[in-house]
């Protein structure tokens, strides 16, 4: 069901011509258009040193509709905008200008950021990342038999990648030493990746030191476990034979 | 003469998305914004957003603006509204509108959307 | 965001009297002289159809009953003589600012 509209009564002008060009309601042979059909913008237009009235479906570019009974004009838009509903909702700024809430700003409001490709002002989106993933099985060269000691992997997802202001992303990839039961590998069984493979727990109160790879220190935002106190970590080594070791990777 | 086509009733669990479409007949559909508006079951009127179908700008209200996209298909003279993330307070009948002049002068016949699980 | 009071919240009306609606705005939606005010009726299952646009015109093929007025922050709808059909929720909507925003609406009722 949709809402209809009547036709909009037009009186006629005096000495006017009835023969008018497509969409004028009205017009004369020197003015062009004088009046229009309804769902039409009344514009003049220069013709050399003549002005001449045209009927248009839609406002050109940097002008906006704004209806009157007896006419619908064409207005333009503020001069920092592009394309608008009226002077004071822009939808569009011109270049070097943000557009936020239907205005153009040099710059953005305190707690949005400019977005170069849309030329918005938007709010500032941080990192959002998963729950980790469970630790993957112990291995070392790609097997899970025939060593003591291998890494452990676990990594999570970036749910939402910050904006150019918001926080950086935390590690996504978390590895560390592990320690298994010594056990032969059976024949055919090198090379394979165990998934049901027993790991061997840290000692009750042992912390997983976490020591980031290169390409964590990239990051400019330090995590706090991932800072270690040196003479903790020697006591640390002479303790502790079976210390489990974690590496982050931050993307 | 002019007319707004949308698309059907839409049953939807909470976190899905659902995509409406608006037809548009009885004038060149690249001449108007074409604007989104909901009401939910009792209530008022609420502004969406809009887009222009000449060149696909669009426009969103801050409240909607990370779920909401608007886009046109200008071959078939339809523009559409896509939901994502859907919670229960998305219930609400969604209407498409012709922006003329700064007033909605024709509106589609309404889109039904429960969002239950 | 332009915030839109209407009042009363209903109203019952007995036929051939006048309905009076008032809209507030939070700030003002003038612009340049004209000010960006429209009010639309609905009917229950039906979409809203325009009644009067920038406060005081009369939409094409809407009786002459239904006028509006007013200018800046306050606006009133009147509906004179009230008829049977006019039973409906009257709405108004401001197009000076983003985003753009409706009152609450005015429910008519017939006495």
């Known amino acids: 069901q949709n809402a209809s509209r009547g036709r909009r009564q037009r009186r006629m002008h005096p000495n006017v011509s009835q023969g008018c060009q497509g969409g004028c309601a009205t017009c004369s042979d020197y003015n062009g258009c004088l009046s229009c059909k309804p769902r039409l913008f009344f514009a003049l237009e220069r013709i050399g040193m003549k002005q001449i009235g045209v009927c248009l479906s839609s406002c050109p570019s940097g002008y906006y509709g704004t209806r009157y009974p007896d006419i619908n004009k064409c207005t333009k838009c503020k001069a920092d905008c592009d394309t608008c509903f009226n002077k004071n909702f822009c939808t569009k700024c011109k270049s070097g200008f943000y557009l936020h809430l239907g205005k153009c700003l040099d710059n953005c409001p305190e707690g949005l950021e400019a977005n170069n490709h849309t030329m918005e002002c938007v709010s500032i989106v941080h990192c959002e990342v998963s729950e980790w993933n469970p630790w993957s099985p112990c291995t070392k060269k790609g097997k899970t038999c025939g060593f003591k000691r291998g890494t452990e992997t676990r990594v999570r997802e970036i749910i939402q990648h910050p904006s150019a202001k918001g926080n950086l992303c935390p590690p996504t990839n978390e590895t560390r030493k592990c320690t298994v039961q010594r056990k032969k590998c059976q024949k055919g069984e090198r090379g394979k990746k165990g998934r049901e493979r027993k790991r061997k727990k840290p000692n009750k109160g042992e912390s997983k030191e976490a020591i980031p790879d290169s390409k964590s220190l990239e990051s400019s935002k330090e995590i706090p476990e991932q800072r270690e106190n040196k003479q903790q970590q020697k006591k640390r080594k002479v303790q502790d034979k079976q210390k489990s070791v974690s590496v982050s990777t931050v993307h | 003469q002019v007319q707004l086509v949308q698309s059907g009733a839409e049953v939807k669990k909470p976190g899905a998305s659902v995509k409406v479409s608006c037809k548009a007949s009885g004038y060149t559909f690249t001449d108007y914004s074409i604007h989104w508006v909901r009401q939910a079951p009792g209530q008022g009127l609420e502004w969406i957003g809009y887009?222009?179908?000449?060149?696909?700008?669009?426009g969103y209200n801050q409240k909607f603006k990370n779920r909401v996209t608007m886009t046109r298909d200008t071959s078939t003279s339809t523009a559409y509204m896509e939901l994502s993330r859907l919670r229960s307070e998305d219930t609400a009948v969604y209407y498409c509108a012709t922006y003329f002049a700064n007033n909605f002068d024709y509106w589609g016949q309404g889109t039904t959307l429960t969002v239950s699980s | 965001d332009i915030v839109l009071t209407q009042s009363p919240a209903s109203l019952a009306v007995s036929l051939g009297q006048r309905a009076t609606i008032s809209c507030k705005a939070s700030?003002?939606?003038?612009?340049?002289?004209?000010?960006?005010m429209n009010w639309y009726q609905q009917k229950p299952g039906q979409p809203p159809k325009l009644l009067i646009y920038?406060?005081?015109n009369l939409e094409s093929g809407i009786p002459a009953r239904f006028s509006g007025s007013g200018s800046g922050t306050d606006f009133t709808l009147n509906i004179h003589p009230v008829e049977e059909e006019d039973a409906a929720t009257y709405y108004c909507?401001?197009?000076?600012?983003?985003?753009?925003?409706f009152g609450a609406g005015t429910k008519l009722e017939l006495k």
């Open positions: 920038a406060a005081s």
């Open positions: 700030q003002s939606v003038d612009y340049d002289g004209d000010s960006y």
């Open positions: 909507q401001q197009s000076n600012e983003d985003p753009l925003t």
């Open positions: 887009i222009y179908p000449s060149n696909g700008d669009s």
